[in-house]
């Protein structure tokens, strides 16, 4: 066990042109804080993947207000170290992500708002117990200077914090086969206590409680010799005496359990027993808890009461991300219906509705004809948020109040002449045409394309359109 320690020295504009604007202003004072995420090995995982070695948040730094006209200086930093405890062996190689966050302290509704200013990442080799390592990383126009180290927590020592030290039993020297513990010369390296029953001849351990087998031996306690002779059973020893084992792809082969988890085979698959602070099918998820305050922007932390359980952040409307760190353009979801205009006011969404629609999301189609009378026998027709009158013959206009000129549309075909009449229009047809709109030619022999003209009317007589 031990602790990874990170000391931030400075965060400010990097060298060269294009210095960033100060993230704080007189109108919007702010302060910084940092988050570190550690993963074992030289992984190139996404920033969102679990911080399997652990994570930590710094305290908030002092409040900073930009001086007008001054270039952005190095910004005031939080006091103290960021410390990430690790329970098991230090892996020696690790990946880190360091995020610089800005907490705005302006007048915005709902108190502080958080935003990510910069994120740096890297992969490093580091032995536990060594000196501070210094580093400089750049993110855009920003530069972060920091130091880090890994140190073992007593009684662990060594480059991986796997050796244990105990106070000397005799004043002069350590017991047989045991070395003094550097740098604690007054203590002695303690023998590791392997898993109970682990074969002293064929097994060994690098961490307390484990039992790793020398080549040629197998079994949980390294008591079963490996043989390549044929077996009755497809996998595993046919009997304790023959010690026959045909290598086969077992679910625990290669130990799928991360972060020091121990693997045990189950009838269907495998099961990982995870060390405290890790969870998940393969012990791949680290133990940031709700007590660490991981939810920003008013997010509520759910679950995660202890390091053995996951937390999730329920984000207020307008924020998303695993820590509610991303602001959402809520209008991009097009919440306003029927062509309404969306306004994101921060504390609420507003929809400005088109005529004929109402409701918080313009979801209600108003009864356009309610209280609307169409004059002169017209009937109201709803549509698209506006009412329309279908007017009786001889009337027009929005409300059918205007007397229409029925001849305006030139309804009489083939040169017929139109006459307005109290009940509509009358077409006087040109010679050779007949019909209400003079649409039918009269045949040369006097027969028409229609049945015979109505009695009392000769072809060519004006015909009233009723």
């Amino acid at each position: 066990a031990g602790v990874f320690e990170l000391q931030i020295h400075s965060f400010g504009p990097g060298p060269g042109p294009g210095a960033p604007r100060s993230p704080c202003s007189a109108r919007l004072p702010c302060r910084l804080f940092f988050r570190v995420c550690l993963k074992p090995g030289l992984s190139e995982e996404a920033a969102e993947s679990p911080c399997a070695l652990g994570a930590a948040l710094s305290a908030r730094g002092p409040v900073y207000t930009e001086q007008p006209g001054a270039p952005a200086p190095d910004l005031p930093l939080p006091d103290g170290l960021l410390q990430v405890p690790f329970r098991d062996a230090w892996p020696g190689t690790f990946s880190f992500i360091i995020e610089t966050w800005r907490e705005e302290l302006g007048d915005q509704i709902g108190g502080p708002a958080w935003s990510l200013l910069a994120r740096v990442a890297g992969r490093r080799r580091l032995a536990a117990g060594g000196p501070w390592a210094r580093d400089i990383q750049r993110a855009g126009a920003w530069e972060l200077r920091f130091s880090y180290r890994a140190r073992c927590e007593p009684p662990a020592v060594g480059t991986a914090c796997t050796r244990l030290c105990r106070p000397r039993s005799a004043p002069s020297r350590c017991g047989p086969g045991l070395r003094p513990c550097a740098p604690l010369e007054d203590e002695c390296e303690a023998p590791l206590v392997c898993r109970a029953g682990c074969s002293p001849e064929h097994g060994f351990c690098e961490q307390p409680g484990e039992c790793r087998c020398l080549e040629g031996w197998t079994g949980p306690l390294c008591t079963v010799p490996v043989s390549t002779s044929s077996c009755l059973s497809p996998r595993g020893p046919s009997s304790a005496t023959t010690g026959c084992l045909v290598p086969g792809p077992g679910p625990c082969d290669g130990n799928p359990c991360a972060n020091g988890g121990s693997c045990s085979e189950t009838p269907r698959s495998f099961e990982c027993t995870c060390p405290r602070g890790f969870y998940g099918l393969r012990c791949e998820v680290s133990g940031v808890t709700c007590a660490d305050g991981p939810c920003f922007n008013g997010g509520l932390c759910v679950g995660g009461a202890d390091p053995d359980s996951a937390y999730i952040c329920h984000c207020p409307p307008g924020f998303q991300g695993s820590n509610c760190e991303k602001r959402v353009d809520r209008c991009s979801l097009q919440p306003c219906r029927n062509g309404g205009l969306c306004l994101d006011l921060g504390h609420a969404l507003r929809c400005r509705c088109r005529a004929g629609f109402a409701g918080p999301r313009c979801e209600h189609d108003l009864d356009d004809c309610a209280g609307r009378a169409c004059a002169n026998g017209g009937t109201c027709v709803e549509g698209g948020g506006a009412h329309r009158c279908s007017c009786a013959l001889g009337f027009g206009g929005r409300d059918c109040r205007e007397r229409a000129d029925p001849c305006a549309a030139r309804p009489c075909a083939h040169g017929g002449r139109c006459y307005a009449h109290f009940s509509g229009l009358v077409c006087a047809c040109a010679p050779g045409y007949m019909g209400a709109r003079c649409e039918f030619p009269v045949h040369p022999d006097g027969a028409s394309a229609l049945p015979a003209a109505p009695p009392g009317l000769r072809p060519g007589d004006p015909q009233r359109y009723l």
Epitope: G110, P112, A291, G298, L300, C301, P317
Partner: antibody
Framework: QVQLQESGPGLVKPSETLSLTCTVS????????WSWIRQPPGKGLEWIGY???????NYNPSLKSRVTISVDTSKNQFSLKLSSVTAADTAVYYC????????????WGQGTLVTVSS | EIVLTQSPGTLSLSPGERVTLSCRAS???????LAWYQQRPGQAPRLLIY???SRATGIPDRFSGSGSGTDFTLTISRLEPEDFAVYYC?????????FGGGTKLEIK
């Protein structure tokens, strides 16, 4: 301004299910999280749970096995069901909207007293 | 869960006096995610303060909130007759959301 109105029976028999509905006006149910809180006579406030229009829910662990909160966006309503009630569930039940800047309660209904008795 | 303890349970005061109500959390409340409510007899609670110190819309400036971590206070600088009520604190840092037991302000 958002207004909330609780409705439902004021008397429920032991072992039955308490059902209440909260009708929201003056705001879209899609804009907020919506919560139920109760207050036994002469006692303090107890959070029951909340729902988001997307269906996300979160319940008080002390009541989780008996509580269901659901939302009906078409009616601008959300509801509470509490099963296997006992006399200890007698309380004034409030519906409330959760603020958009954090999980505190900015608008409350006037409350409805539900008595559990045979 | 975070347990909120309010003290005192009851306070007897006169109009015009200044009063400070305390709310203590069993664990750190991150980001000052703490709210205060007022409940008058027969009414629903009303939001006064959120974010430990921000006044809600329409709340008179005689109400102020302060504190961080585990200790929070609500101060009423000059008591008005309508301020005699029960006051509750509530944390919204983590689930379950929890309320304090309340402090009753009564007229002396």
């Amino acid at each position: 301004q958002v207004q909330l109105q609780e409705s439902g029976p004021g008397l429920v028999k032991p072992s039955e299910t308490l059902s209440l509905t909260c009708t929201v006006s003056g705001g879209s149910i899609s804009s907020y999280y919506w919560s139920w809180i109760r207050q036994p006579p002469g006692k303090g406030l107890e959070w029951i749970g909340y729902v988001y229009y997307s269906g996300t829910t979160n319940y008080n662990p002390s009541l989780k096995s008996r509580v269901t909160i659901s939302v009906d966006t078409s009616k601008n309503q959300f509801s509470l069901k509490l099963s296997s009630v006992t006399a200890a569930d007698t309380a004034v039940y409030y519906c409330a909207s959760i603020a958009v800047t954090g999980f505190y309660f900015d608008y409350w209904g006037q409350g409805t007293l539900v008595t559990v008795s045979s | 869960e975070i347990v909120l303890t309010q003290s005192p349970g009851t306070l007897s005061l006169s109009p015009g006096e200044r009063v400070t109500l305390s709310c203590r959390a069993s664990q750190r409340v991150n980001n000052n995610y703490l709210a205060w409510y007022q409940q008058r007899p027969g009414q629903a609670p009303r939001l006064l303060i959120y974010g430990a110190s921000s006044r809600a819309t329409g709340i008179p400036d005689r109400f102020s909130g302060s504190g961080s971590g585990t200790d929070f206070t609500l101060t009423i600088s000059r008591l008005e007759p309508e301020d005699f009520a029960v006051y509750y604190c509530q944390q919204y840092d983590r689930s379950p959301l929890t309320f304090g037991g309340g402090t009753k302000l009564e007229i002396k």
